[in-house]
């Protein structure tokens, strides 16, 4: 089933039913979206103009899509599964009498159902589910999603994300800066940078003094400690984590089902037992995997390892000597971590431009 590939979604109420006050309609949709955001990492923002991910409209009969409304009764509304344009939108039959009570057709209950479709849910054959195809009145003030509904929506988007516990937003302790600190893996995650080490990771916003730390298991219970390589494809909100012969996909900060998978499915030869470091270059749409003295190149568009790999790191990355602990892509440069140091590398001119302490990101 299709689903949104991002966590932050917009909606717009394109027009209003004359059956109700505008402010009541606004409040009902806010509460209907909240039903789904309460049990997922999804967040919804209302737009007042322009195209939103989820456009909401009230219409009679033929109204511009491939499904005509049938007058009072029968089909109350329909919605479109996630995607661009009409996909994701929700249409309500104006022939119904929309209300906020048990009389007529309760807009809140139908909105929760239709927005379930807008998020990727199909009809359920469980009569207790809000996704059951037949309308029945429930008291909106005591309404709760069924366990089925929660399980189904979380199979698409995962459970709500608890923000990692923040340490005091201050500069790191001097002992931190005096250590010869190395990292297991380093990657961007949205606007943040994650520094993996053993069973935890530090994360911070570049340019901000705050340094935060959390355990891997507290945010992703299914992900093991000792992550060895990581990279992000930001345009897809995808984070890939590697350990030994397995890798995991974190989508919108939620671990994807059907993982871990074997690294050999990516095209590695049997001689590769683990990946030392990985980095995604968005300009080239390639992932570079570093394994001992060699590197491999993976094409994310074709989902194939490029032919003629592996190649020697020292030959194709002048100034870089194996072994590599971690690689970060940031502002068109690669930051190659080796023990207590990192090399800033310009992939355009294929040269090392700086040598820094690996903790320089923390204001050391």
């Amino acid at each position: 089933r299709s689903r949104w590939m991002k966590r932050y979604l917009t909606y717009r109420i394109y027009n209003y039913t004359p059956d109700m006050k505008r402010e009541d309609v606004d409040y009902i949709f806010q509460k209907a979206f909240q039903v789904w955001s309460d049990v997922t990492p999804l967040r919804f923002r209302k737009l007042h103009k322009d195209e939103a991910d989820i456009m909401i409209l009230f219409a009679f009969g033929a109204h511009g899509d491939f499904n005509y409304f049938d007058g009072k009764g029968g089909t109350l509304a329909h919605a479109f599964y996630p995607g661009p344009g009409i996909q994701g939108d929700a249409h309500f039959d104006e022939a119904e009498t929309w209300t906020k009570s048990f009389q007529g057709t309760n807009l809140f209950l139908v909105a929760v159902h239709e927005l379930g479709h807008s998020l990727g849910l199909q009809h359920s054959n469980n009569p207790k589910s809000i996704m059951y195809p037949t309308y029945r009145y429930l008291n909106p003030s005591t309404f709760r999603l069924s366990a089925d509904d929660i399980r189904n929506i979380q199979s698409l988007y995962g459970a709500p994300v608890k923000p990692p516990s923040l340490t005091k937003p201050s500069s790191p302790p001097s002992t931190f800066c005096h250590q010869s600190l190395s990292f297991d893996a380093v990657t961007t995650v949205g606007e943040k940078i994650f520094f993996f080490k053993d069973w935890f990771f530090w994360w911070k916003l570049p340019g901000s003094p705050a340094t935060n730390i959390t355990s891997i298991s507290s945010i992703w219970p299914s992900i093991p400690s000792g992550i060895q390589a990581a990279y992000e494809i930001e345009s897809r909100n995808q984070l890939f984590l590697f350990k030994d012969e397995k890798y995991w996909l974190i989508n919108n900060l939620v671990p994807e089902p059907h993982y871990p998978r074997s690294i050999y499915s990516l095209g590695f030869s049997a001689s590769v037992k683990k990946v030392d470091a990985a980095v995604f270059d968005p300009l080239r749409q390639k992932v570079y995997f570093f394994v001992d003295k060699h590197y491999w190149r993976y094409d994310v568009r074709q989902e194939l390892m490029d032919p003629a790999y592996p190649k020697l790191i020292s030959t194709h990355f002048p100034g870089i000597k194996p072994k590599i602990d971690a690689v970060l892509y940031f502002k068109r440069h690669y930051y190659i971590f080796q023990g207590a140091y990192q090399l800033e590398y310009d992939p355009l001119f294929r040269r090392v431009t700086k040598t820094l302490k690996s903790t320089s990101w923390f204001g050391c």
């Epitope: 299709s2 590939m5 089909t75 329909h78 599964y81 344009g85 009409i86 995808q238 568009r301």
Partner: antibody
Amino acid sequence: EVQLLESGGGLVQPGGSLRLSCAASGFTFSWYNMWWVRQAPGKGLEWVSYIYPSGGNTGYADSVKGRFTISRDNSKNTLYLQMNSLRAEDTAVYYCAVFEYSSSGPQGYWGQGTLVTVSS
Amino acid sequence: QSALTQPPSVSVAPGQTARITCGGNNIGTKSVHWYQQKSGQAPVLVVYDNSDRPSGIPERFSGSNSGNTATLTISRVEAGDEADYYCQVWDNSIDHVVFGGGTKLTVL
């Protein structure tokens, strides 16, 4: 009734250009992703290109990237495919298509196609 | 060469069940759509998102998808089902659409 009517096909020499059009009716064109798909004589379907409703996002098959350009005019309910540097292997029937995936069930519509022949 | 692999042809007697496969790496994690194309006509969507049927498509048409294989199943095959069938994958997260090579269904 949903209708898609392609036009602009014909015989063209290798290296030449053609512009295909697809006139849409029976639905709100500006709400929908539109596709071009082609089929060489006796061969299978090959996706060529798609364009998002606003026209701001497009995708191309590797075989046509850099040579073909998809565009749309929502005020005219028309989809276009500008084909440059045409090759013999571009010879095919070109279809425009539209799809909708809703709680009422999926639906897809295709035009009847326009034949492009690239030959000297 | 297509990343989705279909058998070139499948033959079945009327009233029997036809199964057309579509192979692809981890295809079970993707949404697969199936099209029917009769001779000289434009394609018609017969199964969407692995197993959904558009209105007007008989219940005899069904789909499944897991692992590395998606399958279109046509039960109680009729002479009118004779056509080429194509699987197709499209994912919001990638900018490419891929069709399988097509399978010619012959009703004996």
